[in-house]
């Protein structure tokens, strides 16, 4: 039996010799060299080698426990002469012993944390974590202890958990806001010789309301004319607060004084200033000076800091009223009026009112400041202040009209007042939705019916408020005859779908689709937009290859070289057919190909009447130029194309120089093809058309099953096709037998 225990090996061995692992030994080993020890498994022959005579195992390379802690190997002892096993194959383990070769690594290089200022000692700030790749089950190589290198006496760290806490009472943000703390993580339980890593923790003190507002001065003085209407700002006062954010927000109030009911104070949220405003109409003749007590306070107070004193401060405000010879006073500081954009000329929008505040009560007249209404869109009744339109409006051109109205004392024209008028033009649905962009799209010739080729979007100049509701449809004149349909997606978009299988760019290269877009607003508005759809040749993945109509219907599009090549091709074909027919007549009439599946020889025998109209009509130079574009199922060319809406033909491309090369290539292929009879080469050069029900005669038997085609119609084709009719008319009965 085998005689060994588990083997252990220290990682990261740096000696010059191979590291000795242990010895495999069988009690069958007599020491005469008759036994051979074999090692297999993890790293055998590479990391671990064995002396096949003695069974001594050595490690050839430095091993890293963190990479692989255990190696599982198999030992064999075989008779050196016979190769037969002396001992059963046995599995053994080499365990790699850990050394402290990895330092703790923090999960982050830099931590950021916040803690409120004035926090109690021991308040949690953040927890840092370091991991050590060494073996946590053996020794202290992976036992991490945390300590603070920088940041005392403000913060401390729990050695076991890495939790950072505040260590100093009453840390004040207003004094210092940012702290940089350096934490060390050391293995070996923090003992000497341990490996360490550090991380930086940026700690920010967040604000608490620990500072009250304070006025920089105890007394303020302002002047205001007696004519100041209610709401007029008289002056600004400002208390300062060392806190930030909502803790620095200040509310101002008038707490005392003789002018309590005459004035108001409001807080400017932007600047945190107190604005003293007039609350009631002042009268110099009645009272010339007012003294107020104004208080500034924090609305957000933290009860635990109330011991720091009241979170408010007071100041005295003295207001002196000035005597004025007052101009007319408008009933409002500004007027906001509204009018619909479809308002007729002379429609009254609203009115303004002003009066002389003096005891004389002089009458007033009104006018529009023409500098603010250069286009003279508005007018005012000079007597009663009614504002009316003098021109038609358009909200889509201008939504707001800001004009100024002047009120002047008739008896004293120097005394005048101005007031702003903000006139909002209300939307009327007077604009039709229209396409969001110009749509030119493409359809592949091989496209299937109901295929989405373009998504349409619309825009409307009218006020969308919270959204438009558009619908899309084909214009009535195109709806019945169109080769495409519109699918309204009911989400303000629509799709253009193909209506049929396959398009022929030689018949129609471009379609213009008139699409009607309407809103469901009131009154409904609509417009007709045109979508251009171009028919293109595409590859099997639907990628466009060519969008030019290249067909014989445009002979002008062919170069002289191309025409010569076509004529040459036709001559060669005719000569080939004639020669072949002549040779056949001289030969003994035996079938060229015995198989019933290939009946081309019969076709040649009886196809002596020449090409018919359909054949010549079907010949398409476009196919020669782009053989990949040939469709599996060609559309008939002897049928008048259905009516198309607004067809637009594009001129045929003139670059037919590659036709000659293509024909020569096909000629060469067929000339060197031993299996292709010459008469069949016609099919290689041009598509023969599908005008007749039978497709091309050269493919009568090319269908997938014999039962796919019915040739009874051949008998209707007259005496010339009698032989064919006889041959194929009764094929079904042959097959049954």
């Amino acid at each position: 039996s085998w005689m060994w225990n588990q083997f252990f090996l220290l990682e990261e061995y740096t000696g010059s010799d191979y590291q000795y692992v242990g010895k495999l030994h069988s009690d069958q080993d007599r020491g005469d060299g008759s036994l051979k020890y074999i090692l297999s498994g993890d790293g055998a022959g590479d990391l671990f080698i064995i002396n096949e005579n003695t069974g001594d195992i050595q490690a050839t390379k430095r091993l890293d426990r963190e990479e692989k802690p255990v190696y599982i190997l198999r030992a064999q002892a075989v008779n050196r002469r016979t190769g037969r096993p002396v001992e059963p194959e046995s599995e053994f383990i080499i365990k790699i012993h850990d050394i402290n070769d990895n330092e703790p690594i923090f999960t982050k290089d830099v931590y950021t944390a916040t803690v409120p200022e004035m926090a109690d000692v021991g308040t949690f700030v953040v927890q840092v974590t370091a991991t050590d790749a060494d073996d946590p089950t053996y020794g202290n190589s992976a036992k991490v202890v945390y300590s603070i290198l920088q940041g005392q006496p403000y913060f401390s760290v729990e050695s076991e958990t890495g939790i950072i806490k505040t260590a100093l009472l009453n840390m004040d943000r207003e004094n210092r806001e940012q702290y940089q703390v350096v934490i060390q993580a050391k293995d070996m339980g923090g003992q000497m010789g341990g490996l360490s890593g550090t991380t930086t923790v940026n700690i920010t003190l967040t604000d608490v309301n620990d500072n009250p507002p304070r006025f920089p001065q105890s007394t303020y003085q302002f002047k205001t004319p007696e004519s100041s209407p209610p709401g007029t700002p008289i002056g600004r006062i400002k208390a300062s607060d060392a806190d930030v954010g909502e803790n620095a927000e200040i509310e101002y109030s008038i707490t005392d004084g003789e002018g309590h009911e005459m004035f108001d104070v409001i807080t400017d949220q932007e600047t945190q200033e107190g604005i003293i405003t007039v609350k009631k109409l002042l009268d110099f003749e009645k009272k010339k000076v007012y003294t107020l007590k104004v208080e500034a306070s924090n609305p957000h107070v933290e009860p635990r800091f109330l011991y720091l004193g009241p979170f408010k401060d007071s100041a005295t405000v003295r207001i002196v009223v000035d005597d004025v010879d007052e101009p007319p006073v408008f009933s409002k500081l500004a007027y906001i009026l509204q009018i619909r954009e479809d308002a007729r000329i002379n429609t009254t929008i609203g009115s303004v009112a002003a009066q002389d505040p003096d005891a004389a009560r002089n009458p007033v007249k009104y006018s529009v400041d023409r500098h603010t209404d250069m286009d003279r869109i508005f007018n005012i009744d000079s007597g009663n202040g009614s504002i009316f339109t003098s021109k038609l409006l358009d909200r889509e051109t201008l939504l707001w009209h800001n004009i100024t109205v002047i009120a002047t004392e008739i008896n004293n024209p120097k005394q005048s007042s101005r007031v702003p008028l903000y006139i909002k033009v209300l939307d009327v649905n007077d604009n039709a939705p229209e396409f969001a962009e110009f749509y030119e799209t493409f359809v592949c010739e091989k496209a299937k019916a109901d295929q989405l080729i373009q998504t349409l979007r619309a825009v409307d100049k009218d006020d969308p408020y919270s959204g438009h509701q558009f619908s899309f449809s084909l214009a009535p004149e195109a709806a019945s005859s169109s080769n495409f349909t519109i699918q309204d997606n009911k989400d303000n978009t629509a799709g253009i779908l193909t209506r049929k299988n396959g398009y022929n760019r030689h018949e129609m290269s471009t379609y213009l689709l008139p699409v009607v877009i309407s809103d469901n607003d009131y009154p409904v508005q609509s417009s007709t937009g045109t979508v251009t759809v171009r028919v293109c040749a595409c590859d099997h993945h639907g990628n466009m290859q060519s969008c030019h109509a290249e067909a014989l219907i445009h002979p002008t599009g062919l170069s002289t070289g191309a025409l010569v090549a076509i004529l040459l091709c036709i001559v060669i074909l005719l000569v080939t057919v004639v020669l072949f027919a002549a040779l056949r007549r001289q030969r003994k009439k035996e079938p060229l190909i015995i198989s019933k599946e290939d009946i081309r020889d019969n076709i040649v025998s009886y196809n002596d009447e020449g090409g018919g109209e359909e054949d010549t009509q079907a010949f398409d130079i476009g196919t020669l130029r782009n053989p990949e574009a040939m469709e599996d199922s060609k559309s008939r060319r002897d049928i008048v194309p259905e009516a198309l809406f607004l067809p637009r033909r594009t001129p045929t491309a003139r670059d037919n120089t590659d036709v000659r090369d293509f024909i020569n290539q096909r000629l060469k292929e067929n000339d060197t093809d031993p299996t292709a009879p010459p008469y069949d080469s016609l099919a290689t050069y041009a598509y023969e058309g599908t005008g007749s029900v039978a497709d091309s005669l050269s493919s009568l038997e090319s269908v997938t099953t014999d039962g796919d085609q019915d040739y009874d119609y051949l008998s209707d084709w007259g005496p010339r096709f009698k032989k064919l009719a006889d041959m194929y008319g009764g094929m079904d009965s042959d097959k049954d037998s």
């Epitope: 939307d427 408020y465 959204g467 509701q469 214009a475 009535p476 309407s518 009131y522 009154p523 609509s526």
Partner: antibody
Framework: QVQLLESGGGLVQPGGSLRLSCAAS????????MSWVRQAPGKGLEWVSV????????YYADSVKGRFTISRDNSKNTLYLQMNSLRAEDTAVYYC?????????WGQGTLVTVSS | DIQMTQSPSSLSASVGDRVTITCRAS??????LNWYQQKPGKAPKLLIY???TLQSGVPSRFSGSGSGTDFTLTISSLQPEDFATYYC?????????FGQGTKVEIK
């Protein structure tokens, strides 16, 4: 799903007033023009009034102009029809409907009877 | 105001029949015509808008055609649930007006 629920109908004397409400749910009410359509007993449909999505523009059939007022509160998703100076010929089922041209969703209707 | 005239006023048909209802406008309304279905005691339901666009959720046996002054609603194969009154409505110009209705009854 889209729901429109009218309320406020009932019996009223000629010359009286009534306010109809239509509570909308299941769609963004503020995006759509809204309409009122009525149907006198045994008769066909008659368009009454429409209000645009923002409420900025309102329109009325000649038969109700000056007597009826359409309004909306987009924050409450509610459409209103204030009917004053009611006449016997205003007796009908009043439907609120979504849309300003084609009415793709309708409420179940509320009956207004004007009779002495 | 634009007058909308529907014909016939009523018709009797059997399940599976092809039914055609026409609507004529007193002046051209382009394609701004809707078709509604109304069953007794119920609110109308939009079938077709813009003359030929099928409202979502409406069976494909309903179709609309026409433009200008003459419009047609066709039910290709009448189903039991299709017996109702059908109204056309123009929204070409204010005030929007409805046809007087066509009642489709069981034969």
């Amino acid at each position: 799903q889209v729901q429109l629920l009218e309320s406020g109908g009932g019996l009223v004397q000629p010359g009286g007033s009534l306010r109809l409400s239509c509570a909308a749910s299941g769609f963004t009410f503020s995006s759509y023009a809204m309409s009122w359509v009525r149907q006198a007993p045994g008769k066909g449909l008659e368009w009454v009034s429409v209000i645009r999505s923002s409420g900025s523009s309102t329109y009325y059939a000649d038969s109700v102009k000056g007597r009826f007022t359409i309004s909306r509160d987009n924050s409450k998703n509610t459409l209103y029809l204030q009917m004053n100076s009611l006449r016997a010929e205003d007796t009908a089922v009043y439907y609120c409907a979504r849309g300003g041209g084609y009415f793709d969703y309708w409420g179940q209707g509320t009956l207004v009877t004007v009779s002495s | 105001d634009i007058q909308m005239t529907q014909s016939p006023s009523s018709l009797s048909a059997s399940v599976g029949d092809r039914v055609t209802i026409t609507c004529r406008a007193s002046q051209s309304i382009s394609l701004w015509l809707n078709w509604y279905q109304q069953k007794p005691g119920k609110a109308p339901k939009l079938l077709i808008y813009a003359a030929s666009t099928l409202q979502s959720g409406v069976p494909s046996r309903f179709s609309g055609s026409g433009s200008g002054t003459d419009f047609t609603l066709t039910i290709s194969s009448l189903q039991p649930e299709d017996f109702a009154t059908y109204y056309c409505q123009q929204y070409y110009t204010s005030p929007y007006t409805f046809g007087q209705g066509t009642k489709v009854e069981i034969k």
